[in-house]
Structure formats: structure tokens, C-alpha cells
């Protein structure tokens, strides 16, 4: 489990507790409700949902 305030993830990705790995913030455009999107500074807005 990740300690609060720490991240093993590189820039542009965020830790997913659901998947137990770093995930791409870019994927928050299509899946904004993913748990890791909260850790992305700003999920890019989607012009439309995939």
C-alpha cells in the first residue's frame, strides 16, 4: 500500500490502488472516474467521451 504523500510514479502517471500499479493520466480522458485520476494534477478535459 502507498504511504500518504508519496508516489512511485513518473510524471504523467498516478498510482492506482485498484490496479496496484502506476497508470497514465492521459487515460483519464476516457475514464475520468478511475481511482488514480484523483492523483493526476488535472485530467485533460475530453471534447467528448470515448
Amino acid at each position: 500500500e502507498q504511504a500518504p504523500g508519496t508516489s512511485p510514479c513518473s510524471r504523467g502517471s498516478s498510482w492506482s490502488a485498484d490496479l496496484d500499479k502506476c497508470m497514465d493520466c492521459a487515460s483519464c480522458r476516457a475514464r475520468p472516474h478511475s481511482d488514480f485520476c484523483l492523483g493526476c494534477a488535472a485530467a485533460p478535459p475530453a471534447p467528448f467521451r470515448l
Epitope: D18, M23, D24, C25, A26, S27, R29, R31, P44, P47
Partner: antibody, heavy 119, light 111 residues
Framework: EVKLQQSGGGLVQPGGSMKLSCVAS????????MNWVRQSPEQGLEWIAE??????????HYAESVKGRFTISRDDSKNSVYLQMNNLRPEDTGIYYC??????????WGQGTTLTVSS | DTVLTQSPASLVVSLGQRATISCRAS??????????IHWYQQKPGQPPKFLIK???NRDSGVPARFSGSGSGTDFTLNIHPVEEDDTAIYYC?????????FGAGTKLELQ
């Protein structure tokens, strides 16, 4: 290790039916969108179907070329995805791959299975 | 649908040289933050293998010889220095919308 093990395929006559199966292991299957992509010399790599998550009542998407003829389904309890193909045409001939994506890119692919539609 | 046009269709490169493959989208596939183009390598008798995501981010285990760039409608895959094992067909794919489409592929051969 992620693995997508496919089964099904073979020779079928035009107008016939075939069901493909794909069993996944090594990742959290229920969180991933599952897809079928086919490949032929004529069409190259062609995405044909996707099924998303239980939390959204398993929405599906299809390529226009297969809409109304093909049905994608999944069974999360079996880590499996299926493609039921009806009213098959010669142009459906090709190698069929199952592939998973979280949202954007197809990071894992099955080994492929060949479908030949011919009389 | 967004059409991806790859060029050249085939490419012959000497060992150790640079291979450059282009992928052009029929509409922009980028936001201000990310580009929704991905690259794959396929060898005979094998499924495509995922190489690069979001235009420029290598998958884990992909050698640094592979690099991607571009935004908007124009994208490039570079391989340098080319090695014998790089003989394959390379495809781009977009995830901007449904349907996700692939380019027709670029066949890379060694001289």
C-alpha cells in the same frame, strides 16, 4: 505474466457462424476493456469490437463492417471474452486477435486465430 | 472515422542507421496535454507488440533506440541505431474516438 489464450476459428461457409473465445490471466481482467481486432492482407489491422465494464452494464461498440452480425460478450468470473460471428462473409476471412486496453492502447494481445470463410 | 496514413509503405535501412516512420491523422488527435497515438511492432507469425503510448512514451522493456514524437496530426517513430531484430512491420493507432483505427503499416527491412 499477462496471457490471452484464444480458441475457435477454422473454416466456415459463407452465411455460417463461428464463436471465438479468449481466456485472460495475469492482470485484473474486470477493470479492462476487452477487444477483438482482425488482420487481413486487404484490410490490414482492423478493430472490430469492444466490451467495457460491468459497472456501466457492459457497453459494447462495433465496427460498421460487423454491426448486426457480430456480438461481443464477457464473463468476468471466467476471465473470458467471446465473439459470436453470424452471417459470415468471405471478407471476414483473417486472423482474429483478442486484445485488452485500459482506455487507449492495446497493451496485450492473444496469439491470434485464423478464420476462413469460403465455400 | 479518423484515418491514419503511414509513410513510407516500406523502408530499407542499413544496420546502425536511423529509420524514420511517419503517421499522419486526418484530424487532430491531441489535447493540450496528450497525443492519442500509439505504436506497435509486428513480426511474422506473431501478434502486434505494443511499443509506444501517447506519441512518445515507451512501454516498459522497450529499448531507448525506439522513440516517438509529434502532436496534432503529424507523428513520427524513430529507430536509431537500427538492429537486425528490428525487421518488422510498424503500425500506428489512434484512440481519439470510436472506432480506434490503425495505419496500414510500414515494413522495415535491413540492407
Amino acid at each position: 505474466e499477462v496471457k490471452l489464450q484464444q480458441s475457435g476459428g477454422g473454416l466456415v461457409q459463407p452465411g455460417g457462424s463461428m464463436k471465438l473465445s479468449c481466456v485472460a490471466s495475469g492482470f485484473t481482467f474486470s477493470y479492462y476493456w476487452m477487444n477483438w481486432v482482425r488482420q487481413s492482407p486487404e484490410q490490414g489491422l482492423e478493430w472490430i469490437a469492444e466490451i467495457r465494464l460491468q459497472s456501466n452494464d457492459y457497453p459494447t461498440h462495433y465496427a460498421e463492417s460487423v454491426k448486426g452480425r457480430f456480438t461481443i460478450s464477457r464473463d468476468d468470473s471466467k476471465n473470458s471474452v467471446y465473439l459470436q460471428m453470424n452471417n459470415l462473409r468471405p471478407e471476414d476471412t483473417g486472423i482474429y486477435y483478442c486484445a485488452c486496453r485500459y482506455a487507449d492502447y492495446f497493451d496485450h494481445w492473444g496469439q491470434g486465430t485464423t478464420l476462413t470463410v469460403s465455400s | 472515422d479518423t484515418v491514419l496514413t503511414q509513410s513510407p509503405a516500406s523502408l530499407v535501412v542499413s544496420l546502425g542507421q536511423r529509420a524514420t516512420i511517419s503517421c499522419r491523422a486526418s484530424q487532430s488527435v491531441s489535447t493540450s496535454d496528450y497525443s492519442y497515438i500509439h505504436w506497435y511492432q509486428q513480426k511474422p507469425g506473431q501478434p502486434p507488440k505494443f511499443l509506444i503510448k501517447y506519441a512518445s512514451n515507451r512501454d516498459s522493456g522497450v529499448p531507448a533506440r525506439f522513440s516517438g514524437s509529434g502532436s496534432g496530426t503529424d507523428f513520427t517513430l524513430n529507430i536509431h541505431p537500427v538492429e537486425e531484430d528490428d525487421t518488422a512491420i510498424y503500425y500506428c493507432q489512434h484512440s481519439w474516438e470510436i472506432p480506434p483505427t490503425f495505419g496500414a503499416g510500414t515494413k522495415l527491412e535491413l540492407q
